[in-house]
């Protein structure tokens, strides 16, 4: 008897997983934050520009890129010590002699306002206040971000307990 | 309790050698820059070395390069600096100090220890 | 190298006047400036950075302004707590991070 009385639990969880399903939710993974359409992960320990770059490559996302002052501000806000900063998808590329984002567009001179030089070899970071620029293998803190994707919430019959 | 406990000063003769130690507590050691700065008796400050959080990146100042190492555990907490080769000019009482994390390596020092003192003479 | 020069080397001042203490940089140094302040016997203490952000819980008396290569610290209304030498630092990114040669605030 022992097995058919498993079989039925089984049917049952399962009937249960098809009756509770919800409508498709935007979620952002555990640990990262909401901004807008964007989920952000601030990171918890140092690194040089580059391997900051890489660790979010690792966690399929990128370092943070910013589309204006507003995304700036509300970025700024979610950073509670004046004494902690991080670094950004921005960089100085000495060929096109402009700083350009890891997606390969350009700063455009409204929107951010970098303090320092820009020069080879510099990657830019922000502040609670600020924007600046730094030497690459500076080894500061960084934000990765990715797209807000489409979860199939579930219900877990866990609990229902 | 956030501090920082030098260590391992004392009297050596000139050409002598000395191991400073610096333990860090109450903060994650290894996600600041750490320096050592100098002051000799009734004189002013003196910026000595300092070391990224991950030890890839050193600087020295040009009194003391190529006697003076600067090193750091991050598992133990602690900074240090071996000074080989001292000289009547290196008498001082030596800081560790910990960087603001939020200017990269302009290096403004937010966290200092008691300071050990260091005496060369024969 | 990048030189500082503190001026006055030495001031005398009464508990509630007004201190002002200057550092001249050898060259531009943008806003890449702090201030200390050393009692005898202790270490420094970080009192400004960024040539005008004060730092947490240091006194609101005290500010710091300029940039470029002309900087003030200013204590406006000076304590007995306030006696003590203090030393401007450079900071731009390539070491070495200099400092002042200092300014003794004394009683009056």
């Known amino acids: 008897q022992k097995p058919s009385i498993g079989k039925c639990s089984v049917d049952i969880q399962q009937n249960r997983t098809k009756t509770t399903e919800r409508p498709d939710l935007l979620n952002c993974p555990i640990y990262w934050q909401q901004v807008q359409e964007k989920c952000l992960l601030f990171s918890h320990t140092v690194n040089p520009w580059n391997n900051s770059l890489a660790d979010c490559s690792t966690k399929e996302s990128s370092l943070l890129l910013i589309q204006d002052k507003d995304e700036l501000t509300r970025t700024q806000n979610l950073i509670h010590d004046k004494a902690i900063s991080f670094w950004i998808g921005l960089n100085f590329s000495l060929s096109e002699k402009n700083w350009k984002w890891i997606n390969g567009s350009f700063l455009s001179s409204n929107d951010l306002k970098i303090t320092g030089d820009a020069k080879e070899n510099s990657c830019v970071y922000i502040s609670q206040t600020s924007v600046y620029s730094e030497y690459c293998s500076t080894e500061m803190k960084w934000i990765c971000q990715k797209e807000l994707t489409l979860v199939r919430n579930k219900v877990s019959p866990d609990s229902w307990l | 309790q956030v501090q920082l406990v030098e260590s391992g000063g004392g009297l050596v003769k000139p050409g002598g050698s000395l191991r400073l130690s610096c333990a860090a507590s109450?903060?994650?050691?290894?996600?600041?820059?750490m320096s050592w700065i100098r002051q000799a008796p009734g004189k002013g400050l003196e910026w000595v070395s300092y070391?990224?959080?991950?030890?890839?990146?050193?600087y020295y100042a040009d009194s003391v390069k190529g006697r003076f190492t600067i090193s750091r555990d991050n598992a133990k907490n602690s900074l240090y600096l071996q000074m080989n080769s001292l000289r009547a000019e290196d008498t001082a009482v030596y800081y560790c100090a910990r960087s603001l994390m939020s200017t990269g390596t302009h290096l403004y020092f937010d966290l200092w220890g008691r300071g050990t003192l260091v005496t060369v003479s024969s | 190298d990048i030189q500082l020069t503190q001026s006055p080397s030495s001031v005398s001042a009464s508990v509630g006047d007004r201190v002002t203490i200057t550092c001249r940089a050898s060259q531009g140094i943008s806003s890449w400036l702090a201030w200390y302040q050393q009692k005898p016997g202790k270490a420094p203490k970080l009192l400004i950075y960024a040539a005008s952000s004060l730092q947490s819980g240091v006194p609101s008396r005290f500010s710091g302004s300029g940039s470029g290569t002309d900087f003030t610290l200013t204590i406006s209304s000076l304590q007995p707590e306030d006696f003590a030498t203090y030393y401007c630092q450079q900071v731009t990114s390539v070491p070495p991070y200099t400092f002042g040669g200092g300014t003794k605030v004394e009683i009056k």
């Open positions: 070391i990224s959080p991950s030890g890839a990146t050193i």
């Open positions: 109450g903060f994650t050691f290894s996600d600041y820059y």
